[in-house]
């Protein structure tokens, strides 16, 4: 799977957009030991997928998740 990660660094970024509704959370990979800066999305089926933080859809998705996670549940 393009973008799937077995380790804590990302080497291949997904080339496909992921629907916001399939995303559960994300984390930023900023570790100095990792060559590439990346966003790792966790899907609702538990898969972790690497994405390029410079892509607009990735920025939109992280913003969407930030808003969703900040909204208090009733």
């Amino acid at each position: 799977h393009p973008g799937s990660i077995p380790t804590s660094c990302c080497f291949i970024m997904t080339s496909k957009k992921i629907p916001n509704t399939l995303l559960k959370s994300y984390k930023r990979i900023t570790n100095n030991r990792c060559t590439l800066k990346a966003i790792v999305f966790k899907t609702r089926l538990g898969k972790e997928i690497c994405a390029d933080p410079k892509k607009k859809w990735v920025q939109d998705a992280t913003k969407h998740l930030d808003q969703k996670l900040q909204t208090p549940k009733p």
């Epitope: 799977h1 799937s4 496909k16 957009k17 992921i18 629907p19 916001n20 509704t21 399939l22 899907t43 609702r44 089926l45 538990g46 898969k47 997928i49």
Partner: antibody, heavy 118, light 108 residues
Framework: QVQLVQSGGGVVQPGRSLRLSCAAS????????MHWVRQAPGKGLEWVAV????????HYADSVKGRFTISRDNSKNTLYLQMNSLRTDDTAVYYC???????????WGQGTMVTVSS | DIQMTQSPSSVSASVGDRVTITCRAS??????LAWYQQKPGKAPKLLIY???SLQSGVPSRFSGSGSGTDFTLTISSLQPEDFATYYC??????????FGQGTRLEIK
């Protein structure tokens, strides 16, 4: 090449049980979420259930909730659908299929017919 | 649940024709729509994902467009092997995946 080979279909009486299997080859099965989708004779496609790559997450259509159980054995590269309390409206061709992580379903198995009839 | 409505339910056309099939979602699904082709006795085959992206190995005569609630699948020049049933599928309301009722493409 990528292949999903299904087995376990047949004719069964209402109220009885049946287990479908789907054997995967040609790809890393343990990295993929998997679906079951069914198609009643002459009708359209109906999503049945999905399971995560490691089996920890499962979701079901309301029509089968509490009666069907999706499971997988990654050591055997096999997906299962345990169908209990079968009803006549469960009669359909059942397809196993892979989850792409991007909202669509691919690849698909060849399908197996389940007929529930007295 | 999001409902998907395809039109027409069946269409007759000739080899070489341009054919358009439409799919309407009951609510906004952004661009999270896929199209499948199914031939009698066979499993569905993914043609288009994310509304307009062509799946690897699918001929370029197939194209998809649309976003929000209205989507189209276009076959620019029908080939004999294209006569089949076509389904749309939304991925916006995971895990509740829903398909359209299908459009049967027949030889005129």
């Amino acid at each position: 090449q990528v292949q999903l080979v299904q087995s376990g279909g047949g004719v069964v009486q209402p109220g009885r049980s049946l287990r479908l299997s789907c054997a995967a080859s040609g790809f890393t099965f343990s990295s993929y979420g998997m679906h079951w989708v069914r198609q009643a004779p002459g009708k359209g496609l109906e999503w049945v259930a999905v399971i995560s790559y490691d089996g920890s997450i499962k979701h079901y259509a309301d029509s089968v909730k509490g009666r069907f159980t999706i499971s997988r054995d990654n050591s055997k590269n096999t997906l299962y659908l345990q169908m209990n309390s079968l009803r006549t409206d469960d009669t359909a061709v059942y397809y196993c299929a892979g989850d792409t992580d991007y909202g669509d379903i691919d690849p698909w198995g060849q399908g197996t017919m389940v007929t529930v009839s007295s | 649940d999001i409902q998907m409505t395809q039109s027409p339910s069946s269409v007759s056309a000739s080899v070489g024709d341009r054919v358009t099939i439409t799919c309407r979602a009951s609510q906004d699904i952004s661009s999270w729509l896929a199209w499948y082709q199914q031939k009698p006795g066979k499993a569905p085959k993914l043609l288009i994902y994310a509304a307009s992206s062509l799946q690897s190995g699918v001929p370029s005569r197939f194209s998809g467009s649309g976003s929000g609630t209205d989507f189209t699948l276009t076959i620019s020049s029908l080939q004999p092997e294209d006569f089949a049933t076509y389904y749309c599928q939304q991925a916006s309301s995971f895990p509740s995946i829903t398909f359209g009722q299908g459009t049967r493409l027949e030889i005129k």
